[in-house]
Interface confidence: low
């Protein structure tokens, strides 16, 4: 019995035309939603004038349907048993699942001012930037609609810059009609224990963002893992959103719509400083902001974002060191709401439910030459928004799964 089932599972999780895995892999059968909470700054003038703590109030959720597009240019390579694809990006606003509209206004850090002052450190260039910031009536903070903040707006300051720069700014710009990849993953035909594991991303086995092992593309994309998952395993996966590979460890047994699944979570150790977790030394890329690599819980991904000072963390700076959140008032981290987890059906290795949570922050630093940043007395890693991307297997699919997979085993 069991051997026959194992054989069937091995056959069905291969990524090739005709298998259950392939059908759901090309186009996810799960509805995936991305909820955003925006950090609305309550005291912009105080911060700019007196370098006060930034008072934020989260507003959300604003919900979008995502990952509804099928993978494109799916190409099998029989020689090395891989399948390549692009993952198209698309987002559709869901008003019924949101607290407001895409036209809602927020007071947020001025992304262009913060980024330009960080990228162009030269004093003379900063003087030029200062005159352009003033001329465009830009400031340290700005009021933007949700749609502008997420998907892009024409920045008045950047529009005045006399040399070629992208004048459109947005946290996820460009998004719609773009694609992530090319991913090349093992299809499992020759070795089922490698199924869905990424061979190359954008044609390379390394990212070129980090030193040493931190730069490796490890594991799958977290949508599935090789079958017959054990609780003792450390599940590695790559997330292009955070420009790195990361891992999850077993936390608990969960019953999901009658299907026994293993809940794997991202442990706090993954976000620790090299002092606590020496493996993380290569994620510490500079010494000043990181206080000589002793700060933790924030990841500087500027190298992956054309030099823009973007820092990724967990929502509300969960698992981050006190010095990171100290200049920000109004944060309230808690594990239940703010950690990332994957619910994996162990026989097939399919992720049947997940919650991927992350926060986008921007570094802003004092600058003698830029008037709107002149009064700052310290560096701030400013939270802009946090997101919760979730998906759960539908009832119909769960029934099918129970009858075809878990029902046969039990």
């Amino acid at each position: 019995g069991d051997l026959l089932i194992q054989k069937t599972i091995k056959k069905q999780v291969v990524l090739e035309e005709g298998t259950i895995a392939f059908k759901n892999w090309v186009k996810t059968g799960t509805e995936v939603y991305r909820q955003f909470w925006i950090f609305d700054v309550q005291n912009p003038q105080e911060v700019m004038m007196n370098s006060s703590n930034i008072q934020v109030k989260q507003r959300g959720p604003y919900t979008y349907r995502v990952r509804f597009l099928a993978k494109e240019n799916v190409t099998q390579d029989a020689e090395d048993n891989t399948v390549s694809f692009l993952q198209p990006n698309g987002a559709i606003f869901e008003p019924s699942l949101s607290v407001g509209t895409e036209a809602d206004n927020f007071t947020v850090l001025n992304l262009a001012v913060a980024a330009a002052s960080h990228i162009y450190q030269n004093q003379f260039v900063q003087m030029i930037l200062n005159s352009l910031i003033n001329k465009s009536k830009s400031s340290m903070f700005q009021v933007r609609t949700l749609r502008e903040l997420l998907w892009g707006y024409r920045d008045p300051f950047l529009s005045l810059v006399p040399y070629p720069v992208t004048t459109t700014v947005g946290l996820f710009y460009p998004y719609n009609n773009t694609a992530d990849g090319v991913y090349k993953v093992f299809n499992g035909k020759d070795n089922i224990s490698k199924v869905a594991i990424i061979d190359t991303y954008k044609g390379k086995r390394n990212l070129s963002y980090w030193e040493s092992h931190c730069d490796m593309i490890n594991g799958t994309d977290a949508a599935s893992f090789p079958p017959f998952v054990e609780k003792s395993q450390v599940l590695q996966f790559f997330s292009s959103d955070i420009c790195r590979s990361i891992y999850a460890v077993f936390e608990s047994d969960v019953n999901l719509k009658g299907i026994p699944v293993y809940r794997f979570v991202l442990p706090s150790k993954a976000f620790a400083s090299p002092v606590e977790n020496p493996d993380n030394y290569c994620f510490c890329t500079e010494k000043i902001i990181s206080k000589n690599c002793t700060s933790y819980g924030v990841l500087d991904i500027s190298k992956c974002k054309e030099g823009r000072p973007v820092y990724i963390s967990l929502p509300h700076f969960l698992y981050a060191s006190p010095d990171v959140s100290e200049p920000i008032d109004g944060l309230n981290p808690n594990e239940e709401e703010h950690r990332t987890y994957l619910d994996i059906e162990p026989i097939t290795g399919f992720t049947l439910q997940f919650a991927k949570r992350l926060q986008v922050n921007l570094l802003v630093k004092p600058s003698e030459k830029i008037q709107v940043l002149k009064n700052l007395k310290r560096n701030y890693i400013v939270p802009i928004l946090w997101l919760n991307e979730t998906g759960t297997i539908g009832d119909e699919k769960a029934n099918m799964f129970r009858s075809q997979v878990t029902g046969k085993i039990n």
Partner: nanobody, 118 residues
Framework: QVQLQESGGGLVQLGGSLRLSCAAS????????MSWYRQAPGKERELVGG????????DYVDSVKGRFTISRDNTKNTVYLQMNSLRVEDTAVYYC???????????WGQGTQVTVSS
């Protein structure tokens, strides 16, 4: 193997319309981005526009925006190029194109001639 076959070209008056078709075979058509290119006499082949796999999103070069429309019918494995308000400078051989990600390969049709006369 991948095959792309264009049709619908011909001679047309200035300001007239023409609809080109490209029949595809040898691959799962609905998984692939499809494009149209053209090559005028003595010039390099240039992109006209492309359409994503579902047909939900098409992109065009500035010179044809508002005049040309790309569409596709995944049930017929065919992509179309509707050309309106044709100009003399639209005279060219029009090619249908797709590509595979891995191994990286371009696939072209043999082309269809479009001539716009004044």
């Amino acid at each position: 193997q991948v095959q792309l076959q264009e049709s619908g070209g011909g001679l047309v008056q200035l300001g007239g319309s023409l609809r080109l078709s490209c029949a595809a075979s040898g691959f799962t058509f609905s998984n692939y981005y499809m494009s149209w290119y053209r090559q005028a006499p003595g010039k390099e082949r240039e992109l006209v526009g492309g359409i994503n796999m579902t047909g939900g999103s098409a992109d065009y070069v500035d010179s044809v925006k508002g005049r040309f429309t790309i569409s596709r019918d995944n049930t017929k494995n065919t992509v179309y190029l509707q050309m309106n308000s044709l100009r003399v400078e639209d005279t060219a051989v029009y090619y249908c194109h797709t590509f595979s990600v891995w191994p990286p390969n371009n696939y072209w049709g043999q082309g269809t001639q479009v001539t716009v006369s004044s």
